[in-house]
Amino acid sequence: MNGRVDYLVTEEEINLTRGPSGLGFNIVGGTDQQYVSNDSGIYVSRIKENGAAALDGRLQEGDKILSVNGQDLKNLLHQDAVDLFRNAGYAVSLRVQHRLQVQNGPIGHRGEGDPSG
């Protein structure tokens, strides 16, 4: 039986050390490249094998990056966000939002706040 899909949102501070080939991930998003409807945030689209992010293991594809070294990523053009990462130095602190999909009970069970009925 399928359940209703909900999301658990958590935030985490991730400190990465830039490796020989950099930080090792790709991003999408920005005010000029909205990846998620009505959200101009910056999202991780790819983690590269054996890169710094992959070896650390905490950053995941689909994570939203809220800040880099304390600098907010809100309302940035896509290329400005890319440049921010490229100029972030050797030790890079990322504030990220993970969105974990959770199963919330079987269909037919109406929890509080369920709009049906």
Partner: nanobody, 127 residues
Framework: QVQLVESGGGLVQAGGSLRLSCVAS????????MGWFRQAPGKEREFVAH????????YYADSVKGRFTISRDNAKNTMYLQMNSLKPEDTAVYYC?????????????????????WGQGTQVTVS
Amino acid sequence: QVQLVESGGGLVQAGGSLRLSCVASGRTFSTYTMGWFRQAPGKEREFVAHIGWSGSSTYYADSVKGRFTISRDNAKNTMYLQMNSLKPEDTAVYYCAVAIGSPVDSNRHSDPLEYDYWGQGTQVTVS
């Protein structure tokens, strides 16, 4: 999963022109960074050109600079390679490649490992 289909290859005389196309599936085409590579018989796959997500940033291999032009039409989910002044040494199978998003590291667009998806290729023969 992203599907890539190249077309436009063929046989052309030296000095002639061809225009290759690469159509990509997926609703997020405008977030892809894309490239063209080529492989001649018995040789390694070689970088030809790269284009950023919006089309404003382009990079070329020295061997094709001034002769080839990469472009894209995000409304049509299509990338192009206009090849002019073709030479016999341009003979190869031409592949389009896609990376999802922009790398946050300095441009490594000539590295095939930077790309996530590849087309089947289209043959270009210059006689």
